[in-house]
Interface confidence: low
């Protein structure tokens, strides 16, 4: 991306889309009134510069060179109802939830076909992750290129991440880190955790001492999923930034190559932000690059990153895989998974802010009982009649949906989605098989979390080499 | 290399206790984990119970609790489990073994060489 | 509670010989199995961790596979030592439990 003003009207047309959905996402989250003015004048100066550079009105479901599909919405309807996505909100008006495919025409990624999925297998000589085989997992970056490499022999490493905004961690926060340990296992590569506690500082109403307590907190959790200590290394920024300069070099590196112009297209910053939330992109961008790491990867430049992540981390991504080649680094890969939608409904993700929108990993089983019976969004029928003869609606109904997640056995997922679509399960009987699932898999994971001591969260984040020679 | 030293065998009478210690070396006894096991030729090993000796938290298997107490002495190094109101269900070869996290996916690595209980009138 | 079942209690195999113990679990432990040798003397050794990671220390003729709920301890060319018994054991949940044992004695 250039170093100027948008320089097409397709630039143009997606900093509007953002910039809508930033406005969107300022209502949504009850931010001043000077926030969202400011955030809407920007909003109608970019229109009108499309308008005058175009000819014609923006339409969001119509971008440049596109002829416009036919459709009886008028421009301002079809906008309230595009699904938008940047990361610090997530809308849809749809109680499917967000349409991934459309996701990736926007993003302009890949969508991880049944190929790929074969690719892999043949590549690990390993069965698929459920994530990969029920498209959880279902976009990508470069994916073939990273199984060239190690087709080939040549080192890749993971990179995933965690932005540590509270001490209570929900189950939808551990699908990047459920994945990027069987990735771990089956490419037996190097893996880095960045935990942004000074994104959260930037962001969010804490002291540093508090965002750094919660990172240390999150990664006994992420620990507890199972990773390998000799072969992962978990940082905290306001930690390892402060002692790497080769972490250091590189974020001041991307910082000089991005300019405010593209941080404010790609994540909708207004002149009323801090500094530290506009330059914050170069620091997640950072860790891509291996020499970010010398402990690990001495100072090699070429070892091509794969970062595991939600889909609306891709933003950061996209500026990370735009400046690359301008400093001299490989372009990092991407897998992109869906969303974890909240337990009222797939209409939003689900946030630690709300106690009943998520089940949290330090909930007893007795309060997912009662969460799943009481919060979860039902795709059943009103009465059991009406459920017997017509079946409940597995694309809408949330305990299916998280069953898809953590129900690994293909066969009794698919029975149970053919019991309920056609009516012989009803909705308390999906339930029960939820929280069946769901109450061994907390216990569990609260079980592993207390074999973590402060002496192995210490050794996970101390800057050390990993059992990985790179010459 | 870690190495447990388990204290002696016991004989005793029905309804009585027992202290058996469980003295850790060659490593940080604070960061490890000690866990307790049950071997007899009937039922096999069956799990009794750990505890963090970083901060004494315990976590036991129901079948154990009331009948297994769990405690450390930092400052020595050393484990101790007391079983309480002894019936002859109790004789047994107890272990303690040291569990390892991280490289080891939970894994008890280091055992000590077992005290044996017999309970006996 | 986990149910850990080896099913066969004794096997008898010469010098040289290539033996497999097999372990099978109630449910899906997603590979969080480990495999210990007790010698007649009652000491414990951890062999195999995480279904396939030889601890330090262990010989490379003692391997291990599986998944879900299949489990094996593999001893490729068997040595006077390896007379022994072999426990396997699941560590996904609390509380932790074992196998009854495989003995392997000397044919």
């Known amino acids: 991306m250039p170093n100027s003003e948008p320089a097409s009207l397709l630039e143009l047309f997606n900093s509007i889309a953002t910039q809508g959905e930033l406005v969107r996402s300022l209502k949504a989250g009850n931010a001043s009134k000077d926030e969202i003015d400011s955030a809407v004048k920007m909003l109608v100066s970019l229109k009108m510069s499309y308008k005058a550079a175009a000819g014609e009105d923006y339409k969001a479901d119509c971008p440049p060179g596109n002829p416009a599909p036919t459709s009886n919405h008028g421009p301002d309807a079809t906008e309230a109802e595009e699904d938008f996505v940047d990361p610090w909100t997530v809308q849809t008006s749809s109680a499917k939830g967000i349409d991934y495919d459309k996701l990736i025409v926007r993003f302009g990624s890949s969508k991880i076909d049944k190929e790929l999925i074969n690719r892999i297998e043949r590549a690990t000589g390993q069965r698929p992750h459920h994530f990969l085989r029920r498209g959880i997992f279902f976009s990508h970056r470069d994916m073939n290129q990273v199984l060239d490499a190690y087709e080939n022999k040549k080192p890749f490493y993971l990179y995933t991440g965690r932005g540590p905004s509270s001490e209570a961690m929900h189950v939808g926060h551990l699908i990047p880190f459920i994945f990027t340990k069987w990735l771990q296992d089956v490419f037996n590569v190097p893996l880095v955790i960045q935990m942004t506690d000074d994104e959260k500082y930037l962001w969010k109403d804490l002291t540093l001492d508090q965002a750094y307590s919660y990172a240390v907190e999150n990664a006994k959790d992420i620990i507890a999923c199972g990773f390998d200590i000799n072969k992962t290394f978990i940082f905290s920024d306001l930690d390892y930034m402060g002692m790497s300069s080769g972490f250091y070099k590189n974020v001041v590196k991307i910082q000089k190559h991005v300019t405010f112009n593209q941080v404010k297209g790609i994540f909708g910053f207004t002149d009323s932000d801090c500094i530290g939330k506009i330059s914050f992109p170069a620091i997640q961008a950072a860790p891509s690059f291996s020499n970010s790491f010398p402990q690990i990867f001495r100072d090699r430049t070429d070892i091509q990153c794969l970062i595991p992540c939600a889909i609306d981390q891709d933003p950061y991504f996209r500026m990370t895989r735009d400046v690359a080649p301008r400093i001299g680094y490989p372009k990092p890969a991407l897998l992109h998974s869906t969303f974890f939608p909240a337990l009222q409904g797939a209409q939003t993700k689900m946030s630690a802010s709300d106690p009943n929108s998520s089940i949290f990993l330090t909930d007893t089983a007795k309060q997912i009982k009662t969460k799943v019976n009481k919060h979860a969004f039902s795709g059943g029928r009103d009465t059991i009649e009406e459920h017997r003869q017509f079946g409940g609606n597995c694309d809408v109904d949330v305990s299916f949906m998280y069953l898809t997640f953590f129900l690994e056995d293909d066969d009794k997922l698919e029975q149970i989605r053919k019991d309920y679509t056609s009516g012989a399960m009803l909705t308390g009987e999906l339930k029960k098989a939820l929280i069946e699932v769901l109450q061994p898999l907390i216990a569990e994971h609260q079980a592993r979390r207390k074999e973590v001591t402060d002496e192995i969260v210490k050794e996970f984040m101390t800057p050390r080499k990993l059992s990985f020679d790179f010459q | 290399q870690a190495y447990l030293q388990q204290s002696g065998a016991e004989l005793v009478r029905p309804g009585a206790s027992v202290k058996m210690s469980c003295k850790a070396s060659g490593y940080t006894f604070t960061s490890y984990n000690m866990h307790w096991v049950k071997q007899t030729p009937r039922q096999g090993l069956e799990w009794i119970g750990a505890i963090y000796p970083g901060n004494g938290d315990s976590s036991y298997n129901q079948k154990f609790k009331g009948k297994a107490t769990l405690t450390v002495g930092k400052s020595s190094s050393t484990a101790y489990m007391q079983l309480s109101s002894l019936t002859s269900e109790d004789s047994a070869v107890y272990f303690c073994?040291?569990?390892?996290?991280?490289?080891?996916?939970?894994?008890?690595?280091?055992w000590g060489q077992g005290t044996s209980v017999t309970v006996s009138s | 509670d986990i149910q850990m079942t080896q099913t066969t209690s004794s096997l008898s195999a010469s010098l040289g010989d290539r033996v497999t113990i097999s372990c099978r679990a109630s449910q899906d432990i997603s590979n969080y199995l480990n495999w210990f040798q007790q010698k007649p003397d009652g000491t414990v050794k951890l062999l195999i961790y995480?279904?396939?990671r030889l601890h330090s220390g262990v010989p490379s003729r003692f391997s291990g596979s599986g998944s879900g709920t299949d489990y094996s301890l593999t001893i490729s060319n068997l040595e006077q030592e390896d007379f022994a018994t072999y426990f396997c054991q699941q560590g996904k949940t609390l509380p932790h439990t074992f196998g009854g044992g495989t003995k392997l004695e000397i044919k």
């Open positions: 073994a040291r569990w390892h996290y991280g490289s080891t996916y939970y894994a008890m690595d280091y």
């Open positions: 995480y279904t396939s």
